[in-house]
Interface confidence: low
Amino acid sequence: SEVEYRAEVGQNAYLPCFYTPAAPGNLVPVCWGKGACPVFECGNVVLRTDERDVNYWTSRYWLNGDFRKGDVSLTIENVTLADSGIYCCRIQIPGIMNDEKFNLKLVIKPAKVTPAPTRQRDFTAAFPRMLTTRGHGPAETQTLGSLPDINLTQISTLANELRDSRLANDLRDSGATIRIG
């Protein structure tokens, strides 16, 4: 079953997904799609990386982690109820049927007037994120406002492979991680 992540309307949702490149700069193509992972590729692609960089993204979908080190976690800006559903992170490892597929369920809750839990505020203070919408209109700055609800029994045991990025290490307990090479 899918790991479930939550965000409130108007916040930025965070869907973690990691892998460890065999060598720095040797990136593996990754796609993010709306809907469960199909047999091949991603359906309804919202963002894609190639062997070098992000080569396709749509207006509210960003990789704000260090994707050059394998943090391909997806941030969805300013979510609405329509963003609820299953998202597919597919790490496209070369070879037949070698892809790693992760289905992540995003649940969007109506905005509350009450403050967010302390853990969420602490996370945002420690790791503010700027989302730039260059190429899609005027630049905007927002901070990540929600941490996913984590089912610890569903965590990848390979998360400790992510040594390069402090952010990745802090997030590894909530992310899908796969070692490449």
Partner: antibody, heavy 117, light 108 residues
Framework: QVQLQESGPGLVKPSETLSLTCTVS????????WSWIRQPPGKGLEWIGY???????NYNPSLKSRVTISVDTSKNQFSLKLSSVTAADTAVYYC???????????WGQGTTVTVSS | EIVLTQSPGTLSLSPGERATLSCRAS???????LAWYQQKPGQAPRLLIY???SRATGIPDRFSGSGSGTDFTLTISRLEPEDFAVYYC?????????FGGGTKVEIK
């Protein structure tokens, strides 16, 4: 508009460590990558390395053994340390943003560092 | 490491003329990650073109970029006095990030 300002000593003795700081103003350092580039007198540009605001780094292999780049998000600064310098490290040192999508779109004005005894 | 070779080393032209600068890579560069910069004496480089052909913010449309694979071109359709400078290409999709040696566009 983000602006960058390099600072640090203009003269460093051979075998010592060169230390420079880049201060980011007009925006948050919490976005993508921050690079150091240098340009020896009368020569071309050489990329030294970059740091992601989370602290993740990537260095030019030709300098990797001597380079450390760090970030201080609370001060909106990132720094360069280059150890065991020689006269060949004399250059103008630039800091720049590196979004990963657009190339290096904002640069500091550069600071000249001379290595001499 | 991807080595970028720029030619010619120096281009002597008059204002109003067309300038064509070449950048050749030792191995294929994704066109999404090829940039051009302009540098004037005593100044920092300025981003002109990213993604091989997209103009950066505020860059006049007389500057255009093209090419793919290993061969890229920067064209200045009609040189203005302020365009005389050194131009560098850079690939930023493969580590280490590398720059070409530069082409100096000087007044004839």
């Amino acid at each position: 508009q983000v602006q960058l300002q390099e600072s640090g000593p203009g003269l460093v003795k051979p075998s010592e460590t060169l230390s420079l700081t880049c201060t980011v103003s007009g925006g948050s350092i919490s976005r993508y990558y921050w690079s150091w580039i240098r340009q020896p007198p009368g020569k071309g540009l050489e990329w030294i390395g970059y740091i992601h605001y989370t602290g993740s780094t990537n260095y030019n292999p030709s300098l990797k053994s001597r380079v450390t780049i760090s970030v201080d998000t609370s001060k909106n600064q990132f720094s360069l340390k280059l150890s065991s310098v020689t006269a060949a490290d004399t250059a103008v040192y630039y800091c720049a943003t590196d979004t990963g999508y657009y190339g290096m779109d904002v640069w500091g004005q550069g600071t000249t560092v001379t290595v001499s005894s | 490491e991807i080595v970028l070779t720029q030619s010619p080393g120096t281009l002597s032209l008059s204002p109003g003329e067309r300038a064509t600068l070449s950048c050749r890579a030792s191995q294929s560069v994704s066109s999404s990650y090829l940039a051009w910069y302009q540098q004037k004496p005593g100044q920092a480089p300025r981003l002109l073109i990213y993604g091989a052909s997209s103009r950066a913010t505020g860059i006049p449309d007389r500057f255009s970029g093209s090419g793919s694979g290993t061969d890229f071109t920067l064209t200045i359709s009609r040189l203005e006095p302020e365009d005389f400078a050194v131009y560098y290409c850079q690939q930023y999709g493969s580590s280490p990030l590398t720059f070409g040696g530069g082409t100096k566009v000087e007044i004839k």
